[in-house]
């Protein structure tokens, strides 16, 4: 039976949420972010084999055409399906402020 | 000046909308779709160099970390930012129906 969450390539190799620890310098944020000084970035990494976490009909089409024309049409890609908010203490023109970003940390992943 | 729509790799090589002509057989739809018999599939194809059509802050982070850890973090990926609807005449248990799909044809593209 088809299982959109079972990776045929082996455990952990397909599209899933990963956490990458990064400093403000790594992110290019050192000149405007004050805290947190280390960020645990959640992002979507991994392969998108056929029928694995397909986001929609477009992803199905893309996979079918990729199999037919692999040099022209790329395979679906592992991207965030939704995001978690993140708060940063950042520099502003007038001082410092807390700012929440809604599009910064991946919450879960799918293939598009 | 930074321009998120100017491709540094040369014209047409960065993330953009492409049209791929496909038959129902190509798409694996021949057993359930009656019309159209050829579909002009619009999809997002192309490279995502730094700052090109970045969808959000997550895409910026991903690019920065990709440059630092290219073996661990992939570059951002060219995916649909929105979709155009498409109507299909399809077989049903009781006969034939017109069905509109909202997630089938890419309308425009960005890098995530």
């Amino acid at each position: 039976a088809r299982n959109g969450d079972r990776c045929p390539l082996g455990p952990g190799r397909c599209c899933r949420l990963h956490t990458v620890h990064a400093s403000l310098e790594d992110l290019g944020w050192a000149d405007w972010v004050l805290s947190p000084r280390e960020v645990q970035v959640t992002m979507c990494i991994g392969a998108c084999p056929s029928q694995f976490r397909e986001a929609n009909m477009h992803a199905q089409i893309k996979m079918n055409l990729h199999r037919l024309k692999p040099d022209t049409v790329p395979a679906p890609c592992c991207v965030p399906a939704s995001y978690n908010p993140m708060v940063l203490i950042q520099k502003t023109d007038t001082g410092v402020s807390l700012q929440t970003y809604d599009d910064l940390l991946a919450k879960d992943c799918h293939c598009v | 000046a930074r321009n998120g729509d100017r491709c540094p790799l040369g014209p047409g090589r960065c993330c953009r909308l492409h049209t791929v002509h496909a038959s129902l057989e190509d798409l694996g739809w021949a057993d359930w779709v009656l019309s159209p018999r050829e579909v002009q599939v619009t999809m997002c194809i192309g490279a995502c160099p730094s700052q090109f059509r970045e969808a959000n802050m997550h895409a910026q982070i991903k690019m920065n970390l990709h440059r630092l850890k290219p073996d661990t973090v992939p570059a951002p990926c060219c995916v649909p930012a929105s979709y155009n609807p498409m109507v299909l005449i399809q077989k049903t248990d009781t006969g034939v129906s017109l069905q509109t799909y909202d997630d089938l044809l890419a309308k425009d593209c960005h890098c995530v």
Epitope: L34, S35, P36, R37, Q40, T42, M86, I89, L98, T100 | -
Partner: antibody
Framework: QVQLQESGPGLVKPSQTLSLTCTVS??????????WTWIRQHPGKGLEWIGA???????VYNPSLKSRVTISVDTSKNQFSLKLSSVTAADTAVYYC???????????WGQGTLVTVSS | DIVMTQSPLSLPVTPGEPASISCRSS???????????LDWYLQKPGQSPQLLIY???NRASGVPDRFSGSGSGTDFTLKISRVEAEDVGVYYC?????????FGGGTKVEIK
């Protein structure tokens, strides 16, 4: 507005494990940047940072308590918890849960719960 | 661990008059980004602590402008320009430069 509420037994016997839970309401514990923190205050004394947890589960502890402390998170229940093992009378304190950005800016606190260690 | 020392231990004040609390750290709290990683908290009788000042001199949301933080490196001051009756309680400084964050012993402000 986010609210934090501590819960757990007010009396623990010496050598046993103190267990407290902090329930977060009015906001998600899954917010990045925030560290969900435990701080205690001995009777009539100052404040001591115990440790903190990020929603992903990574933790940081005060070295002075590290061997006895475990902080965990249950994102499905929007809760995080403190366990302090092998308690003595010196662990008698008001225990607060709080939300900070990394190790600073604790702008939301629970009301605190007094835990007495006594036989 | 960084040791935080506050003075005075107790501060009797007259409503409408200014008040000043000193905090000294055993090592510099000045980060390479130019900001001092120091918070000030007020614990009113029978209540949880509340954030007044973060990053040395930035008032937290909702804190009256009669409160101000200053100083750099190892020497910091919290000033109340005109004390009000509701300002009574114990004031704590806290270093946030490195883990574990550590608090000063507190300064008890009471009305004369």
């Amino acid at each position: 507005q986010v609210q934090l509420q501590e819960s757990g037994p007010g009396l623990v016997k010496p050598s046993q494990t103190l267990s407290l839970t902090c329930t977060v309401s009015g906001g998600s514990i899954n917010s990045g940047g925030y560290y969900w923190t435990w701080i205690r205050q001995h009777p009539g004394k100052g404040l001591e940072w115990i440790g903190a947890i990020y929603y992903s589960g990574s933790t940081v502890y005060n070295p002075s308590l590290k061997s006895r402390v475990t902080i965990s998170v249950d994102t499905s229940k929007n809760q995080f918890s403190l366990k302090l093992s092998s308690v003595t009378a010196a662990d008698t304190a008001v225990y607060y849960c709080a939300r900070g950005v990394e190790y600073q800016h604790f702008n939301e606190w629970g009301q605190g719960t007094l835990v007495t260690v006594s036989s | 661990d960084i040791v935080m020392t506050q003075s005075p231990l107790s501060l009797p004040v007259t409503p409408g008059e200014p008040a000043s609390i000193s905090c000294r750290s055993s090592q510099s709290l000045l980060h390479s980004n130019g900001y001092n990683y120091l918070d000030w908290y007020l614990q009113k009788p029978g209540q949880s602590p509340q954030l007044l000042i973060y990053l040395g001199s930035n008032r937290a949301s909702g804190v009256p402008d009669r409160f101000s933080g200053s100083g750099s490196g190892t020497d910091f001051t919290l000033k109340i320009s005109r004390v009000e009756a509701e300002d009574v309680g114990v004031y704590y400084c806290m270093q946030t430069l490195e883990a574990p964050p550590t608090f000063g012993g507190g300064t008890k402000v009471e009305i004369k």
